[in-house]
Interface confidence: low
Amino acid sequence: AMHVAQPAVVLASSRGIASFVCEYASPGKATEVRVTVLRQADSQVTEVCAATYMMGNELTFLDDSICTGTFNESRVNLTIQGLRAMDTGLYICKVELMYPPPYYLGIGNGTQIYVIDPEPCPDSD
Amino acid sequence: AMHVAQPAVVLASSRGIASFVCEYASPGKATEVRVTVLRQADSQVTEVCAATYMMGNELTFLDDSICTGTFNESRVNLTIQGLRAMDTGLYICKVELMYPPPYYLGIGNGTQIYVIDPEPCPDSD
């Protein structure tokens, strides 16, 4: 299995934005890399977002995705937005080297993202 | 040594208030208990607040203390207020059974308090 490193804890900003780096130890020069963010809460795992990086292009998530990211060699800078307190949980980075063969897969230990809902601003008169 | 339990992680509210329970395994019925909250950050330990509980009275911190608390048998409900992001750190609960003898002391493993500064509200026109 390929080693994937990610921070243990990240705090979302009061705007509900959390950023972290997912780094993998690549055994070779992959031209096609798939990155998936999974959320684990109450022993259930759900997919948050996924994107495929093609060498020379940008890391592109779907238009309605809550994730954005940039790719730099074997480091993926991930940003998740629109987070609420109820989204607090363990966010796991999964990296797959799709091409060229052989296929490699690595799964990080997860980043605990803490989210605090902001107090509403007082109404302006 | 006396066993002291406290939660591993607590999130401060967006108002900068964090609450947690500090529970100790008391070998007897102490009539005077001293509770101290210590903050550990960058290997430095500083005292945040301290109070002595006398059986039948309330747990009273100094007037200018950022801590408040209530006492219920061997459970201390602590609240720390006025926290900013820079106050993120490990908050350690120290409990001393002062009277009657013998003296017992217990130190918890600490509660990691995460604090996120709120976004300022937009100016009202």
Partner: antibody, heavy 125, light 107 residues
Framework: QVQLQESGPGLVKPSETLSLTCTVS????????LSWIRQPPGKGLEWIGY???????NFHPSLKSRVTISKDTSKNQFSLKLSSVTAADTAVYYC???????????????????WGQGTSVTVSS | DIQMTQSPSSLSASVGDRVTITCRAS??????LAWYQQKQGKAPKLLLY???NLQDGVPSRFSGSGSGTDYTLTISSLQPEDFATYFC?????????FGQGTKLEIK
């Protein structure tokens, strides 16, 4: 060096009060506690109670109603009084310095670190 | 009250043997345990306090271990002067009860 010496009558009549004295040297009565322990013939040890340096006392629940422990700092003496004695109170009576061992400035552990040689008391008419 | 159960109640061993005595508390005593040695007709002598700490002047062949409810006194290599009765005592709140004792005899 630390020394403790028990003294008192070797024979006490049933229903009377047993009075023993423990004379100490080599340590301060204002810093330590003193415990009384007894050992019936051919049996194990039974903790009777202690008096702390500040005069606070604590007794074995089964003897509480019959025991008084006091001290006379000026004479470096402690006394034990046990009222309404019966044959079951026949034993060797020991006094022992009760010490709190502190280390790492964190914990206080207790032990009976110095004992007198004991005085034999028989309850018989 | 916390009950202290010591085992074995008696033990035969030879000089040079390694001997282990155990003490079990009826509830967690958080290492607030002392071990004493008592020779015939003499007062008990403190060997170890806080479960593992050797009292000043006690030979290093004596050692203690354990936590929670289970504790052990070990004599690594028995000497002739070690044949005696051994008691454990908890000091986790009063009353400070003792184990019933282990009599260590020459085989």
């Amino acid at each position: 060096q630390v020394q403790l010496q028990e003294s008192g009558p070797g024979l006490v009549k049933p229903s009377e009060t047993l009075s023993l004295t423990c004379t100490v040297s080599g340590f301060s009565l204002t810093s330590y506690g003193l415990s009384w322990i007894r050992q019936p013939p051919g049996k194990g040890l039974e903790w009777i109670g202690y008096i702390w340096y500040d005069g606070n006392t604590n007794f074995h629940p089964s003897l509480k109603s019959r025991v008084t422990i006091s001290k006379d700092t000026s004479k470096n003496q402690f006394s034990l009084k046990l009222s309404s004695v019966t044959a079951a109170d026949t034993a060797v009576y020991y006094c022992a310095k009760t010490e709190g061992h502190y280390y790492g400035s964190n914990y206080g552990y207790y032990a009976l670190d110095y004992w007198g040689q004991g005085t034999s008391v028989t309850v018989s008419s | 009250d916390i009950q202290m159960t010591q085992s074995p109640s008696s033990l035969s061993a030879s000089v040079g043997d390694r001997v282990t005595i155990t003490c079990r508390a009826s509830e967690n005593i958080y290492s607030n345990l002392a071990w004493y040695q008592q020779k015939q007709g003499k007062a008990p002598k403190l060997l170890l306090y806080a479960a593992t700490n050797l009292q000043d002047g006690v030979p290093s062949r004596f050692s203690g271990s354990g936590s929670g409810t289970d504790y052990t006194l070990t004599i690594s290599s028995l000497q002739p002067e070690d044949f005696a009765t051994y008691f454990c005592q908890h000091l986790w709140g009063t009353p400070y009860t003792f184990g019933q004792g282990t009599k260590l005899e020459i085989k």
